[in-house]
């Protein structure tokens, strides 16, 4: 269950892959496309609104946190639309919906090496948002060693990951190397 209905905090960041390809969200009323590609030099990067929630989980489950608490996020590229995990089709989709959001819109946030994060499906532990054939897709990760596989690693730019210290506290990080690399900055956005 997610502790409380309101997020702990929210901030804006542009999302890119481990290889620095940008994620662009092309939404129309009846259709959408999510581009994963090298962005032109003069083009503005899309941003997503990340809403952070604290989740109570059994302590044996993976995730960044202590005492069985984990950070979960929802990702919204524009008002009223959220990324959803479609586990049946192994796809990442954009859906318009009202709060409270369905479980498919929640992802466990993992802080990885090299200032990267990964997003694990709340509805399907071991399955992560990843990049496949220049599209976002759901990718099954078989073992903890594969958590560092490049295609499930993402960068959140224009952020200052130290802000995570405020959310979970520096002591909550499992890996000391990650502490130095993460300084997330807190952005407010009024839409």
């Amino acid at each position: 269950s997610i502790t409380g209905i309101s997020p702990i905090t929210e901030y804006l960041a542009s999302l890119s892959t481990y290889n620095d390809q940008s994620i662009t969200f092309a939404l129309e009323d009846e259709s959408y496309e999510i581009y994963v590609e090298d962005l032109k030099k003069d083009e503005k990067k899309d941003k997503v609104l990340l809403s952070y929630y604290e989740s109570q989980h059994p302590s044996n489950e993976s995730g960044d946190g202590v005492d069985g608490k984990m950070l979960m996020v929802t990702l919204s590229p524009t008002k009223d639309f959220w990324l959803h995990a479609n586990n049946k089709e192994h796809s990442v989709e954009l859906h318009k919906c009202e709060k409270p959001l369905p479980d498919q819109a929640f992802f466990v946030l993992h802080n990885m090496h090299s200032n990267c994060v990964s997003f694990e499906c709340k509805t399907d532990p071991g399955v992560f948002i990843g990049v496949k054939d220049n599209h976002l897709a759901l990718i099954k990760v078989d073992s903890s060693e594969n958590l560092c596989t490049e295609n499930i690693l993402f960068k959140l730019s224009e952020t200052n990951p130290a802000f995570l210290y405020k959310v979970v506290g520096a002591a909550d990080y499992k890996d000391d190397d990650d502490k130095a690399a993460h300084h997330h900055h807190h952005h407010h956005h009024h839409h």
């Epitope: 804006l12 092309a26 939404l27 032109k40 030099k41 941003k47 997503v48 590229p77 839409h191």
Partner: antibody, heavy 126, light 106 residues
Framework: EVQLLESGGGLVQPGGSLRLSCAAS????????MSWVRQAPGKGLEWVSG????????YYADPVKGRFTISRDNSKNTLYLQMNSLRAEDTAVYYC???????????????????WGQGTMVTVSS | SYVLTQPPSVSVSPGQTASITCSGE??????AAWYQQKPGQSPVLVIY???KRPSGIPERFSGSNSGNTATLTISGTQAMDEADYYC?????????FGGGTKLTVL
């Protein structure tokens, strides 16, 4: 079906004012940035002004800065262009245009213009 | 201000390939769009993001963009393709159009 219907054009004297409207339907108006583009008789297209999600996110071409004001009323699904201190060189067909994609939290316009209205003619002459 | 330059006119025989260029400083660093405008009608988007076609636009329309030049290519040109064509970009939340090219199908 996306529809954009401009109105408010007409004949006005130099120095006069005019307010153009663009009634939108067939899409979630509040989710898209909108622009005005004009075309003088026998000439090419010229972008005039654009507006994103609120009154602070407005953009203008240099020739109209300080004279034209773009605004939107999301409750009425309508885009406006208030034109003051009109000059002969403002004579043109004025098109209302919708960005192809919905706005993103990065803000600003999301080129290109995917849909256009039929235009309304503005003539500035004494 | 940013300037996009197009040839005023291009002629092509039916069934042949027409190419319309649009030049601007570091054009390849921006995403180009192309609009078709027939006499007495509103412009219609035919290419966006350099190479992508909106639904309903025939496959014979294609685009490219690199260096200082974007190009609209119409293969197997038909009489109905006769129109004015405008390139455009967005530069710092300001729309910029080329001067337009009149495509004549002989």
């Amino acid at each position: 079906e996306v529809q954009l219907l401009e109105s408010g054009g007409g004949l006005v004297q130099p120095g006069g004012s005019l307010r153009l409207s663009c009634a939108a339907s067939g899409f979630t108006f509040s989710s898209y940035a909108m622009s005005w583009v004009r075309q003088a008789p026998g000439k090419g297209l010229e972008w005039v002004s654009g507006i994103a999600d609120d009154f602070t996110s407005t953009y203008y071409a240099d020739p109209v800065k300080g004279r034209f004001t773009i605004s939107r009323d999301n409750s009425k699904n309508t885009l406006y262009l208030q034109m003051n201190s009109l000059r002969a060189e403002d004579t043109a067909v004025y098109y209302c245009a919708r960005d192809l994609w919905m706005m993103n939290y990065a803000g600003g316009l999301r080129y290109p213009f995917g849909y256009w209205g039929q235009g309304t003619m503005v003539t500035v002459s004494s | 201000s940013y300037v996009l330059t197009q040839p005023p006119s291009v002629s092509v025989s039916p069934g042949q390939t027409a190419s319309i260029t649009c030049s601007g400083e570091r054009m390849g660093d921006k995403y180009a769009a192309w609009y078709q405008q027939k006499p007495g009608q509103s412009p219609v988007l035919v290419i966006y993001r350099d190479t992508k076609r909106p639904s309903g636009i025939p496959e014979r329309f294609s685009g490219s963009n690199s260096g200082n030049t974007a190009t609209l290519t119409i293969s197997g040109t038909q009489a109905m393709d006769e129109a004015d064509y405008y390139c455009g970009v967005l530069k710092q939340d300001t729309g910029v159009f080329g001067g337009g090219t009149k495509l004549t199908v002989l």
